[in-house]
Amino acid sequence: QAAKEVLLLDSKAQQTELEWISSPPSGWEEISGLDENYTPIRTYQVCQVMEPNQNNWLRTNWISKGNAQRIFVELKFTLRDCNSLPGVLGTCKETFNLYYYETDYDTGRNIRENLYVKIDTIAADESFTQGDLGERKMKLNTEVREIGPLSKKGFYLAFQDVGACIALVSVKVYYKKCWSIVENLAVFPDTVTGSEFSSLVEVRGTCVSSAEEEAENSPRMHCSAEGEWLVPIGKCICKAGYQQKGDTCEPCGRRFYKSSSQDLQCSRCPTHSFSDREGSSRCECEDGYYRAPSDPPYVACTRPPSAPQNLIFNINQTTVSLEWSPPADNGGRNDVTYRILCKRCSWEQGECVPCGSNIGYMPQQTGLEDNYVTVMDLLAHANYTFEVEAVNGVSDLSRSQRLFAAVSITTGQAAPSQVSGVMKERVLQRSVQLSWQEPEHPNGVITEYEIKYYEKDQRERTYSTLKTKSTSASINNLKPGTVYVFQIRAVTAAGYGNYSPRLDVATLEEASGKMFEATAVSSEQNPV
């Protein structure tokens, strides 16, 4: 079993575009070129010699290291003598830098320069002048560098140009290998031998099927120059759902599970759960039982709580206080909270609809940890049903019928709602006639309307009021040529309603005897 070179990348062998990543895009450029035998090949060139402080990166595609541990990189390149480039002696360079970056997978198109490890600065043994260009004498430099030991599944090579005029004619990446074995549930792949006769190369193993590395204890062995594996260190352990059997990981049997690779053996399923297939990392819950997302796999499955008990209420006009006792069965959990569902019901058929968002709850409607709540802003003389539901961490997972305690009530009297449709009927020099519509919800018998008015300039510092029983009124003794603000509210035995939106009206000027329609200067929707 002789050690052999295994090719991972050979840019010359690729007929199509290499499509490596160039950053910035104005730096390295892929073009067709000729090798030393004048055979067409894909090359990368850069010649940004005008500006100082160049930092042009070229990154290969992700190279899977396969069975490699120590990598050899062979570069063939040509480098143009700075003297052959006019007027750039201060900024032109004649070296470039070689880097690599190890990853377990393709990390995408971004080159994160700070993650790359420098292998070496590459200088040409021979650069060429313009005289060589004319004769097409491409002085090809060959440099070989070694990377290793590598621990991840693959890597990128990167070439950093700092202001040279270079063509990368060929990039070849290869390794020499030892043969594969399995030890401590780890497969040690065909791997690079040591670069010297006496050297030992540390190699990271790849876990067998259904195994993973033990935390901070990666499986490693040493590959000698003779191709023998020595000194095993670290190990792999069977993944969740599997346990070790010889050099393999076998699945847990039915009614057993293993939730973590850290567990040595499979365990029997917890209460109210089961597994009916092999290789389970967790057990499924029985019908009617559930596991919350935050529940660890080793706890028993649980169910939603029963309904709250002993629901009582107290009504104060349009406010209702509810109080109850905890449910008899908490479902096997200690995270019980309560939520309130309010429904408004009609007088006739007893049909109910959700209350809507204008109802207030103290302290809150859902997530209640205490066993009481106050519901406010209900309609007067209306029928309501309140459902109080106990909820735990698995309630939302259940598809079965909700369990709740319910109570139906009728509210008392409330103040009237806002007056609407305020209009100016007539505007004179010293009087304004207004009309309006009665509130949509009088909530009782309207005893009178109150009109508040003031000069707009006064900004409500001083205002007057006028009371009337009808839905129109004439306000007299006003100043001519003045903007007044008017607001109206309804009054019942239960109290005062909210004022209507402000209405701005300008009385006629004294000089003008002519009647005209005044225009509303402004209007707003929010009552004072």
Epitope: S26, C47, M50, P52, R136, C165
Partner: antibody
Amino acid sequence: QVQLLQSGAEVKKPGASVKVPCKASGYTFTSRAMSWVRQAPGQGLEWMGWINTNTGNPTYAQGFTGRFVFSLDTSVSTAYLQISSLKAEDTAVYYCARVRFTVYGDGMDVWGQGTLVTVSS
Amino acid sequence: EIVLTQSPATLSVSPGERATLSCRASQSVSSNPAWYQQKPGQAPRLLIYGASTRATGIPDRFSASGSGTDFTLTISRVEPEDFAVYYCQQYGPSWTFGQGTKVEIK
């Protein structure tokens, strides 16, 4: 995209001066040198010289020293060609062209649309 | 100063035919020339630089060869859009253009 934008045609009297701008966009102005090329009516191309846009250092071809001056305003990515003491034989289209250095040789890879300068009394 | 001489001054070809344009230097030049195409009323366009590298977007029917003093631009199959004037240009310490070859429809 990469563009070099030159000004419109100029008509000048003999002895006068003209300053032809060349505004670059779509790339880092100071990363590439700028050449100037003259083409008299019905004639071929004449290389006038080039300017290092990074250092501002100009190089003039034979026959284009003295009255011809290359300059830059890097803040607006613009190169200028100034011709003083204009003569009738200066009547031509003047092109700016971005210089491309490569490992295997050089060339001018992006050209302005040209500015026609007519010198007539 | 190196003088570049292009021949012929005018080349008449039919579409689909091969066109061979010559560029001769007055002395051995230190670099292969660049080649440009210019159509009436337009700026020149870079075709080939660095002896044989085609500029971006230039079709592969254009190729260049030669060394020392004799250089050639070849259009393998002339397309209707290829009828134009072609210039060679050397880029030693001082750059110079040839006087141009006009490729016209036969």
